[in-house]
Interface confidence: low
């Protein structure tokens, strides 16, 4: 048999808090336990779920957990079933709500001397105790014409008068806790003698010298007083007007009329109503003078045919807000169609060439009108006036390639040479009409040129081939003065190019023929063995049929090339001693000798007292210092050639002789001792 060891019991529970209904069973075989609520099976949720055989509540809910719970144990094999005793919760709760008007039915029906009942919609179990407040101050039962009914949660004001006006709220507390009204009720009972607004003045915007009217009315019993004040608190009446409000009139109904309004009249006007009792009511209205600023300039616009474009008109600052419209050719644009206005925008859909022209944005308000033009150009694809032609250009002269096009707006022309953009420099120049000028045509300018003419609407391009007509010229021109080494073989080259391959020959300048040991082989003058007589002036002549002939004059010198008789040696000198670097060269013409020390040429005229270069070319340095150390180069040169040789100079401290060394021991390196 199934036996309940622990049965659920009825208990107090708090709304939103934890609870547990216990159930424990003992049976000979396996049983499964489930729970019923008012006879229906309980489904597990995150809030309410089976915990072993017991039923656990994470947060008790007064609506979902009200009813009778029962624990059921069932043996699925035998079908035996046992049910526990019933258990239920006594759930304690409190819930806030608003303060509402119970009587009369609507706020509009509240009159002085009528009964007013308010209800506090705070509920709970056990029933809470209520406390009422007006403007935050507690109200006690039976005081000052009001009664509190705790059972009905009502506050009754009988009769209600102006002194009962205020913000009503309520709070309630019970064993569970406390809550206050979620929404409070404002009771407003007018005192007939208080001034009330019937008509409030509105802000007005007027143009200069126009008139402005402010309306203002109050009501009360007995009738209230009404007074107008301007900004500086000056009263405005028909009898006493401030100097700057001479044209002000106050009408019997309270309206204030200002005529011929000027800037000094702009400002805040106050209408003050005062009843027999109660505070004055102050209503304010501002008089603004209409104004309109200038409009910003438009940049000219370029559009392409077939596209859709918009131009936004920023309205000028103004009061009142200026209205904006667009015009074209003096006609206001519609708000639909192909060319139309949308908001502040000019819209051109599927643009045609005929849409080009001046469009005007107008802005206007009471203060006046402003306008601003925008010039719209409809771009067209360029068309050819003159395409570039295949051309023959002469080397060394300026060359021109045309690229003449027309379009709206004026097209932009760029040139390409071998597909590379030509940037203007000293050799290339693109004229405004698109023509390309090559300032001094060179042989390698013979290639393909392409020009492209563009507008926002599109581009066209064409190409042409340039052939360069070569000059007859030496390539390279022979050096005008050349040397040949005596008693050696020598060659003097001469080559030239032209539109046709030129013939090249050498001759002596005096017209005499070349000796037999000198040959002219396809422009190269060849000396088998140079003699002194080979020196002199020679002319190289290049010629072809169409271009005639050109000449290059060369003066040949015969020389004995330089050799060194004495070369400087690696030298080490004690500090303070004198260093001698010897150098002697021979050749014809006789060579001159220069020295270079520490990477600079030693100028004989600026050497100072410590250094000297002898006639034979040797260099002497007195009183040497460590900074004199370094490489020294002897340079020998004449009009025909130049040779150099170098050696290092080391400056060292003089060693103090040690006793172990005899007075005659040599130093470990070559020394100059002076």
């Amino acid at each position: 048999a199934i036996v309940f060891i622990k049965q659920p019991s009825s208990q107090d529970a708090l709304q939103g808090r934890r609870a547990l209904l216990r159930c424990e069973v003992e049976a000979p075989g396996p049983v499964h336990v489930y729970w019923l609520l008012d006879g229906a099976p309980v489904q597990d949720t995150e809030r309410r779920f089976a915990q072993g055989s017991s039923l656990s509540f994470a947060a008790v809910d007064r609506l979902q957990d009200s009813g009778t719970f029962q624990c059921v144990a069932r043996d699925d094999v035998t079908g035996e079933e046992a049910r526990s005793a019933n258990a239920s919760f006594n759930i304690k709760w409190i819930e806030a709500g608003p303060v509402v008007l119970k009587h009369p039915a609507s706020e509009a029906e509240i009159q002085p001397q009528t009964q007013v009942t308010l209800r506090c919609h705070i509920d709970g179990h056990p029933r809470p105790t209520y406390q009422w407040f007006r403007d935050g101050t507690p109200l006690s039962d039976g005081q000052s014409n009001h009664t509190v009914s705790s059972k009905e949660r009502n506050l009754t004001l009988r009769p209600a008068g102006p002194e009962h006006s205020g913000l009503y709220s309520c709070c309630a507390h019970s064993a569970f806790g406390q809550a206050c009204s979620s929404q409070n009720f404002t009771l407003s009972i007018a005192d007939e003698s208080f001034a009330r607004v019937v008509l409030a003045p509105q802000d007005v915007v007027v143009a200069r010298y126009e008139e402005a009217m402010f309306h203002c009315q109050f009501s009360a019993q007995p009738p209230p007083s009404l007074q107008w004040l301007f900004e500086d608190e000056t009263p405005i009446t028909n009898r006493s007007r401030p100097p700057h409000l001479r044209r002000a009139t106050v009408f019997a109904n309270g309206s204030l009329l200002l005529t011929q309004v000027r800037p000094r009249n702009a400002g805040i006007y106050r209408c003050i109503g005062q009843g027999q009792r109660g505070p004055p009511i102050i209503l304010e209205a501002t008089l603004h003078l209409a104004e309109i600023e200038d409009m910003p300039l438009f940049e000219p616009r370029v559009f392409t045919a077939g596209s859709e474009e918009r131009v936004t008109c920023l309205p000028p600052k103004g009061l009142p807000e200026p209205s904006v419209w667009w015009e074209h050719a003096g006609v206001r644009l519609p708000t639909h169609g192909r060319v139309y206005q949308k908001g502040h925008e000019l819209v051109l859909a599927n643009i045609a060439e005929s849409d080009a022209g001046v469009y005007t944005c107008h802005a206007a308000n009471l203060a006046g009108q402003r306008r601003q033009d925008v010039n719209i150009t409809v771009a067209t694809v360029p068309s050819w006036l003159k395409k570039p032609q295949d051309s023959q250009l002469e080397e060394g002269k300026p060359g021109y390639l045309d690229c003449l096009t027309q379009a709206t707006p004026k097209p932009t022309v760029v040139w390409y040479r071998n597909q590379m953009l030509i940037s203007e420099d000293s050799r290339f120049e693109v004229f405004k009409n698109g023509t390309l000028r090559i300032n001094s045509v060179e042989v390698y300018d013979g290639t393909w040129y392409r020009c492209m003419s563009s507008t926002p609407a599109g581009s066209i391009e064409a190409q042409a081939r340039v052939q360069v007509l070569e000059k007859l010229k030496f390539t390279p021109p022979p050096q005008p003065q050349q040397c040949m080494e005596f008693d050696k073989e020598a060659t003097v080259p001469c080559s030239a190019t032209g539109r046709e391959k030129p013939t090249i020959k050498w001759e002596r300048a005096d017209g005499s023929s070349l000796p037999e040991w000198v040959t002219d082989n396809a422009g190269t003058l060849h000396f088998a063995r140079v003699t002194r007589d080979d020196a002199g002036n020679y002319t190289c002549i290049a010629s072809n049929g169409p271009q005639g002939q050109i000449r290059a004059h060369v003066q040949l010198t015969v020389a004995v090339f330089i050799t060194f008789k004495v070369e400087p040696e690696r030298t080490t000198v004690y500090q303070g001693h004198t260093a001698l670097l010897q150098c002697e060269a021979q050749g014809d013409p006789k060579p001159l000798i220069q020295w270079k020390g520490k990477d600079r040429i030693l100028d004989p005229t600026k050497l100072g007292p410590r250094m000297h270069i002898f006639q034979n070319g040797s260099l002497v340095i007195h009183d040497v210092a460590p900074e004199d150390s370094g490489r020294y180069t002897c340079i020998a040169g004449n009009s025909c050639n130049i040779k150099h040789t170098e050696a290092p100079l080391y400056v060292v401290d003089k060693p103090v002789p040690e006793e172990s060394e005899g007075p005659g021991s040599p130093p470990p390196y070559k020394m100059i001792q002076t």
Partner: antibody
Framework: EVQLVESGGGLVQPGGSLRLSCTAS????????VIWVRQAPGKGLEWVGI???????YYANWAKGRFTISRDTSKNTVYLQMNSLRAEDTAVYFC?????????????WGQGTLVTVSS | EIVMTQSPSTLSASVGDRVIITCQAS????????LAWYQQKPGKAPKLLIY???KLASGVPSRFSGSGSGAEFTLTISSLQPDDFATYYC?????????????FGQGTKLTVL
């Protein structure tokens, strides 16, 4: 709180007329384009028409000639006049407010009013 | 007549999924970016999510984002939440030149997988 409230919906016979109102609180409706959108039961949203701040109106092709939008600035209200109504005009009609006078995209919607066209 | 094509028409997904809805217009939009996305739940008015193609409306969670320009746009929900199951609409603004000022997509119904 800014809100739009539609009214005037109800049951009407085919061929009949109806005028819907859209009243704003918390904003001056004259500063915005106002759009009417409808939604047939179980279907998607469908643009009906628009009235701009400068009182220009545009309509969906199917609405041209039968529907008219107007505004009364003093009442802060926009109207949709619907004539020659058909069964297929049965829908919830929403009025909506644009972002500004030059952007038609809808920023604020009303709660909608049901129009039923049936005999 | 301008047509806004939304895809897919229906979409089943799970909480945490990344969801992408596309909207294609038959012509370029006003300013190339005048497009808004709205969420609608049964019996309610639509709610603005995204405007000007990519700007997040006030109070809308950052998991919603929009992108695109010209005629093709997308709405992305980076990590789907239980509250996101609803119908989504795109709204495109056009020039009014042909009379079409606004056009809605046919809607995408997002349901629980």
């Amino acid at each position: 709180e800014v809100q739009l409230v539609e009214s005037g919906g109800g049951l009407v016979q085919p061929g009949g007329s109806l005028r819907l109102s859209c009243t704003a609180s918390g904003i001056d409706l004259s500063n915005y384009a106002v759009i009417w959108v409808r939604q047939a039961p179980g279907k998607g949203l469908e643009w009906v028409g628009i009235i701009y701040t400068y009182d220009t109106t545009y309509y969906a092709n199917w609405a041209k000639g039968r529907f008219t939008i107007s505004r009364d600035t003093s009442k802060n209200t926009v109207y949709l006049q619907m004539n020659s109504l058909r069964a297929e005009d049965t829908a919830v009609y929403f009025c909506a407010r644009s972002f500004s006078d030059i952007s038609d995209l809808i920023k604020l919607w009303g709660q909608g009013t049901l129009v039923t066209v049936s005999s | 007549e301008i047509v806004m094509t939304q895809s897919p028409s229906t979409l089943s997904a799970s909480v945490g999924d990344r969801v992408i809805i596309t909207c294609q217009a038959s012509q370029s939009l006003y300013n190339n970016k005048a497009l808004a996305w709205y969420q609608q739940k049964p019996g309610k008015a639509p709610k603005l999510l995204i405007y000007e193609a990519s700007k997040l409306a006030s109070g809308v969670p950052s998991r919603f984002s929009g992108s695109g320009s010209g005629a093709e746009f997308t709405l992305t929900i980076s990590s789907l939440q239980p509250d996101d199951f609803a119908t989504y609409y795109c709204l495109g603004e056009f020039s009014c030149g042909s009379g079409d000022c606004l056009a809605f997509g046919q809607g995408t119904k997002l349901t629980v997988l």
